[in-house]
Amino acid sequence: HTAAQDNCTCPTNKMTVCSPDGPGGRCQCRALGSGMAVDCSTLTSKCLLLKARMSAPKNARTLVRPSEHALVDNDGLYDPDCDPEGRFKARQCNQTSVCWCVNSVGVRRTDKGDLSLRCDELVRTHHILIDLRHRPTAGAFNHSDLDAELRRLFRERYRLHPKFVAAVHYEQPTIQIELRQNTSQKAAGDVDIGDAAYYFERDIKGESLFQGRGGLDLRVRGEPLQVERTLIYYLDEIPPKFSMKRLTA
C-alpha cells in the first residue's frame, strides 16, 4: 500500500483530500490549497505544506557555532508560490506587491523590495543545523545511542538517506543535528533535507503532518526524548544578500 488504498488516505500528509479517482480506481491525494497531486509514499514538499497550512482555517566542545551567513526563519508563515514540482519559486510576493527572494526551504534571503525585484535562481540550502534543547532527564543520554536513534528516525520516519545526516552533536541538554545535501548529491527520489527538517520541526512542536493522530514517539533506550525548544539554521550554497542596514540593526 502507498496511499493506503483500503481507506484512501495519505499516510505522509494529513493536509490532503483523497479519492479513488486515480488510474484504475487507485487512491489519489491532492494537497489542500494548491490542489496538486502528491506522492503519499514520501514526504510532501515544504512549499505545498505551507500553502496547505495557509489555506486551512485559521568533553571537547562539540557544538557547532552557526556561520555568520546562517539564516533563521524569522518571517514565519506566508502563503508561498510553488512551482509545478511543488518547490518554492525563487521570488515570493505578498498581496501588497512586496517581494523578496527565498532559498530552497522558503526562507527569505534578501531585503524586501517591490515587483521589480529579480531573483534569478532558487538558491539551494545545502546545510541545515537543527539545534534542540531537551527537557531535564535523570541523566544525560548516551551520545552513541542518541546518535543512532536520531539517524534511524530520519531514515525511517522521514525517509532521508543516511548519508545526508552529517553529524549529531550532544552536550547536555543541547542536541544538534546537521543535515547536508549539495545539489550534486541529491538524486531523483531522494528526500530533500529541507522537507525532512520541516517535518521534524512540526513533529517536535506536536503538530505532526503525518496522518496518524498519535504524533512523534521518540525514545532513546526507552527514555522519552522531549524537546523544549528548537532553533533551525539554514546555510545556502550562495550567501544571502542583505543590506548593511539590516546587519547592524
Epitope: 500500500h1 493506503a4 483500503d6 481507506n7 488516505t9 499516510p11 505522509t12 534511524r152 528516525l153 525511517e156 520516519r157 505532526s208 503525518f210 496522518q211 496518524g212 493522530r213 498519535g214 504524533g215 512523534l216 514517539d217 521518540l218 525514545r219 526507552g222
Partner: nanobody
Framework: QVQLQESGGGSVQAGGSLRLSCAAS????????MAWFRQTLGKEREGVAI????????RYADSVKGRFTISRDGTKNTMSLQMNSLEPADTAMYYC????????????????????????WGQGTQVTVSS
C-alpha cells in the same frame, strides 16, 4: 515494503490457550506501533491489542483484558499474542498489523478511526474455540 506473516492459530477447547506469532519482513517495523485485530464473518475488523514500538505500553479491548497478553521482540522483529482462558466468542480470523509511519505514538484501541493508522496487514490465522 512491510510484509507480515501470522502463525499459531488452530482449534482449541474453551478455557484453553494459544500463542499467536507475527513475523515482520522489514527492519523498520522495529520502530512502528503494532497491533492484533480479529474479524468474524460479516463483521467489521476489531482491535484486540496494541503495543508501542518500545514494547513498554500496551492496550487491550475490554473483552480480552486479563486473558490476552501482547508482546514484541524488537531484535527478532516479531510480535506475539498469548491467549489464555479462551471462549467461543474469541473464534475469529486474527490479523497482525503494523502502523503506516515509524515512530508514531499508538492510537487508542477504541479509536473508531484506528484502521486508518494500520495499512500493513498479514494474511491472518484462524482461531476456533469450541465449547
Amino acid at each position: 515494503q512491510v510484509q507480515l506473516q501470522e502463525s499459531g492459530g488452530g482449534s482449541v477447547q474453551a478455557g484453553g490457550s494459544l500463542r499467536l506469532s507475527c513475523a515482520a519482513s522489514d527492519y523498520s517495523t522495529g520502530r512502528r506501533c503494532m497491533a492484533w485485530f480479529r474479524q468474524t464473518l460479516g463483521k467489521e475488523r476489531e482491535g484486540v491489542a496494541i503495543i508501542d514500538y518500545a514494547g513498554t505500553s500496551t492496550r487491550y479491548a475490554d473483552s480480552v483484558k486479563g486473558r490476552f497478553t501482547i508482546s514484541r521482540d524488537g531484535t527478532k522483529n516479531t510480535m506475539s499474542l498469548q491467549m489464555n482462558s479462551l471462549e467461543p466468542a474469541d473464534t475469529a480470523m486474527y490479523y497482525c498489523a503494523a502502523a503506516a509511519i515509524p515512530y508514531e505514538r499508538c492510537p487508542d484501541i477504541s479509536d473508531p478511526q484506528i484502521l486508518v493508522s494500520f495499512p500493513y496487514w498479514g494474511q491472518g490465522t484462524q482461531v476456533t474455540v469450541s465449547s
